[in-house]
């Protein structure tokens, strides 16, 4: 099996983690696709997935997790607003092709949350953003049953992550609606 | 085959303002995040904004913010980019593109010059 | 900002052999890596994203490489038309940056 590294971001609550998951597009345009938690001896967990087949640009959101599969570009983007400590974790994107085992990425994400102020709700000091508005959208899609194996051997997309942080108009939408969903059972 | 047209530039005086448009074909306009890149004369290649769909997520690139915004019309598929209290180093060519992080379509850029 | 550094600046080659681009970063971008092509009054053109995924249409003698700070750009067989500037280019975080250019010319 491939050895998995992971990337460390240490965020406070408040911030986004904004997560750009790149994969061939020709290959996998349309799979479905998955963001994933992976807890100490557990197999990971699917905490939200794009349609089936995936839509292109149409976000899909899930508690605070807002999922952006961008077909033209070969990229899903995953965001989780308003991060809380208990979001702390070990994160990633997959991709479902039953009847084969979902490929997953090389380059988890290791999520910290600290507490502290973060200026306004998703934002910091280091922003080039000036306009950021949480979608409305409550499209929501059924995932898979099953759970991906812990074993590597292939891994198309590759993942990054970054502070989301507007600096001068913020919109939250729905914001209440929003935080008010645990991302975990 | 994706299209990326634009035009409005020229030569302009410092402090002045000039309008870049982008008219966009090809592909679902819509659907794609957009943005500017600049090119000074005989330089590299410079990031200036991207755009969400929905405009909902606007960036700038720290040297602009506050004198260009970046717009744009799905109804009319076209990009624009209003440039005020332009300065000698945004003299470049601007190309129009499609995508917000990596770019995978180019106009073929329009020149701005800025001088007295 | 992360800063993009590439190396060299100016790499002399002949046609038929390969060459190998450096591209630095100053902090850790993962694999949110792009390379583009730009010939002489053109337009840049997408090579290669995910550090590693060669955009549609990119002949397969382009190959892309690394990830967290250190990257390769491969072309295994110089042709004619491959003698141009490229840059690589992070989008990991804002605001987005190129690199500062490799220029391939004929040796």
């Known amino acids: 099996a491939t050895k998995l590294t992971e990337e460390k971001y240490e965020l406070k609550e408040g911030q986004t983690l904004d997560v750009k998951c790149d994969y061939t597009l020709e290959k996998f345009a349309s799979s479905q696709k998955a963001w994933q938690i992976i807890r100490d001896g557990e197999m990971p967990k699917t905490l939200a997935c794009t349609e089936r087949p995936s839509k292109n640009s149409h976000p899909v959101q899930v508690g605070r997790i807002i999922l952006e599969d961008y077909h033209d570009h070969g990229l899903l983007r995953v965001r989780m607003v308003n991060l809380q400590v208990e979001d702390s974790g070990l994160y990633q994107c997959v991709i479902y092709q039953p009847p084969k085992e979902p490929h997953m990425l090389f380059d988890r994400i290791r999520l910290v949350v600290t507490k502290g102020f973060s200026g306004t709700p998703g934002s910091n000091e280091n922003s080039t953003q000036n306009v950021y508005k949480i979608p409305p959208t409550t499209t929501k899609a059924l995932c898979p049953l099953y759970t991906s194996p812990r074993t590597v051997t292939q891994a198309p997309p590759k993942s990054t992550a970054d502070v989301s942080t507007p600096d001068s108009e913020i919109n939250l939408t729905n914001v209440t609606d929003i935080i008010r969903v645990p991302v975990f059972n | 085959e994706v299209q990326l047209v634009e035009s409005g530039g020229g030569l302009v005086q410092p402090g002045g303002s000039l309008r870049l448009s982008c008219a966009a074909s090809g592909f679902t306009f819509s659907s794609n995040w957009m943005s500017w890149v600049r090119q000074a004369p005989g330089k590299g290649l410079d990031w200036v904004a991207s755009i969400k769909q929905d405009a909902s997520e606007i960036y700038y690139v720290e040297s602009v913010k506050g004198r260009f915004t970046i717009s744009r019309d799905n109804a009319k598929n076209s990009l624009h980019l209003q440039m005020n209290s332009l300065r000698a180093e945004d003299t470049a060519v601007y190309y129009c593109?499609?995508?917000?992080?990596?770019?995978?379509?180019w106009g073929q850029g329009t020149l701005v010059t800025v001088s007295s | 900002e992360i800063v993009m550094t590439q190396s060299p600046a100016t790499l002399s080659v002949s046609p038929g052999e390969r060459a190998t681009l450096s591209c630095r970063a100053s902090?850790?971008?993962?694999?949110?890596l792009a390379w583009y092509q730009q010939k002489p009054g053109q337009a840049p053109r997408l090579l290669i994203y995910g550090a590693s995924i060669r955009a549609t249409g990119i002949p397969a003698r382009f190959s892309g490489s690394g990830s967290g700070t250190e990257f390769t750009l491969t072309i295994s067989s110089l042709q004619s038309e491959d003698f141009a500037v490229y840059y690589c280019?992070?989008?990991?975080?804002?605001?987005?940056?190129f690199g500062g250019g490799t220029k391939v010319e004929i040796k």
């Open positions: 593109v499609r995508g917000g992080w990596r770019f995978e379509s």
């Open positions: 280019q992070q989008y990991k975080n804002w605001p987005l940056t």
């Open positions: 902090q850790s971008v993962s694999s949110n």
